[in-house]
């Protein structure tokens, strides 16, 4: 930003342009640049008790530029301001201050919060969520068949994440218990939601087939476990015939 900084030249008289350096059009030994070459900005820098004129390609931090017909001039922003549009309107505050409507503040006003990235006071943003999606089918261990009591879930999306002081988001999924009329799993039916069923490690001599839920594939040798399974299934068939209700859902 401080390109073409004007260097003071000794033995120069005011309003003499020969020998001026660093963008000065006219300069003096005592005051440095008095005027600048075209398109450069004139700024007065305080050095001790005296002010030195300097010519720059753009105004330094803490100053704003005005392009008058006869001079491009840098004017100081307010003390707490790093970049400004004019004396009244700051656009970037110095470290430790927060920008709010053109002013630099120590703390943000009530109802606003400090954004420590932009160093501005911003509106507090509360979480916003969508409407609930429909309930999922009733499942148990990822299956939609071969059981009577399972669970169903529904989800909603976060539409707006909250800011630091904003209200936190409510839960985005909800699960409840559900009761359905037992339905036999058809041959090869998994009823799974993508996931593979966990396979039990077979004992010695057992088939590596996964244990079927109903009339599934069976190994030639029937294990005690498989026999027990068959008996359970027969019992379930009888219970199912006795049941009249089809699908009762209750939230717990």
């Amino acid at each position: 930003q401080n390109a073409s900084r004007g260097r003071r030249q000794r033995r120069m008289h005011p309003n003499v342009s020969q020998g001026c350096q660093g963008g000065c059009a006219t300069c003096s030994d005592y005051n440095g640049c008095l005027s600048c070459k075209p398109r450069l900005f004139f700024v007065l820098e305080r050095i001790g008790m005296k002010q030195i004129g300097v010519c720059l390609s753009s105004c330094p931090s803490g100053y704003y530029g005005t392009r008058y017909p006869d001079i491009n001039k840098c004017t100081k922003c307010k003390a707490d301001c790093d970049t400004c549009f004019n004396k009244n309107f700051c656009t970037k505050c110095k470290s430790g201050f927060y920008l709010h409507l053109g002013k630099c503040l120590d703390n943000c006003p009530e109802g606003l919060e400090a954004n420590n990235h932009t160093m501005e006071c911003v509106n507090i943003v509360h979480c916003e969520v969508s409407e609930w999606n429909p309930w999922s089918p009733c499942t148990k261990k990822g299956k939609t068949c071969g059981f009577k009591r399972g669970t169903e879930t529904r989800v909603r999306e976060i539409m707006q994440h909250p800011s630091a002081k904003g209200n936190l988001c409510p839960p985005t999924n909800e699960t409840r218990k559900c009761t359905v009329q037992r339905k036999k799993c058809q041959k090869g039916e998994r009823g799974k939601k993508g996931r593979e069923r966990k396979r039990k490690k077979p004992n010695k001599g057992e088939s590596k087939e996964a244990i079927p839920d109903s009339k599934g594939l069976e190994s030639s040798k029937e294990t005690p476990e498989q026999r027990e399974n068959k008996q359970q299934q027969k019992k379930r068939k009888v219970q199912d015939k006795q049941q009249k209700s089809v699908s009762v859902s209750t939230v717990h």
Epitope: Y68, F85, N86, F89
Partner: antibody, heavy 116, light 107 residues
């Protein structure tokens, strides 16, 4: 509270003179460039002249150069516009305004009518 | 001088409408653009400076955007008090110049 109050407007014949004043309060007058902006009836805004904060430099629109003179008295917090050789096309509401790149503060305006 | 061209010159809209006014500069003015609102018989009031920054007290339904030569003023949901004339002004260099104004009227 910032206040700019214009006075001196009125009806004047072409070729005659008028002097407008603007009394400022509620801000540091001597820190600001000051300007006159005018608005002809039913028309848009038109910048007329600006004087820098210390009175050392003045700027005018071409159509008023040599006829209008802007001046200020920082000890009295007052801005002036001396208008000579007035023409019919100078008829407008004249606003005084604090001019710091934008026109941040405005007066309520004073009407100048140039008519024979 | 830098010429500022505003469009449209007049606009009819209803309360609740979203309205956009554009301002075109004849040369690059960076973000040195100001918007004013003026009501009949009143002085202009500064709304937006530096192309997009809201002046204190201006409702957030007003917004400004643009850089270089193309700028817009948007009112997201018109309120009865927004019916007025709007002017853009380049603050890039002297001599300061205004757009010709956009009169926003009730439909």
């Amino acid at each position: 509270e910032v206040q700019l109050v214009e006075s001196g407007g009125g009806v004047v014949q072409p070729g005659r003179s008028l002097r407008l004043s603007c009394a400022a309060s509620g801000f540091t007058f001597s820190d600001y460039d000051m300007a006159w902006v005018r608005q002809a009836p039913g028309k848009g805004l038109e910048w007329v002249a600006t004087i820098i904060y210390d009175g050392s430099r003045t700027y005018y629109r071409d159509s008023v150069k040599g006829r209008f003179t802007i001046s200020r008295d920082n000890s009295k917090n007052t801005l002036y516009l001396q208008m000579n050789s007035l023409r019919a096309e100078d008829t407008a509401v004249y606003y005084c305004a604090a001019h710091d790149r934008s026109f941040d503060y405005w007066g309520q305006g004073t009407m100048v009518t140039v008519s024979s | 001088d830098i010429q500022m061209t505003q469009s449209p010159s007049s606009l009819s809209a209803s309360v609740g409408d979203r309205v956009t006014i554009t301002c075109l500069a004849s040369e690059d003015i960076s973000n040195d653009l100001v918007w004013y609102q003026q009501k009949p018989g009143k002085a202009p009031k500064l709304l937006i400076y530096a192309a997009s920054r809201l002046q204190d007290g201006v409702p957030s339904r007003f917004s400004g955007s643009g850089f270089g030569t193309d700028f817009t003023l948007t009112i997201s949901s018109l309120q009865p008090e927004d019916f007025a004339t709007y002017y853009c002004q380049q603050s890039y260099k002297y001599l300061p110049t205004f757009g010709q104004g956009t009169k926003l009227e009730i439909k």
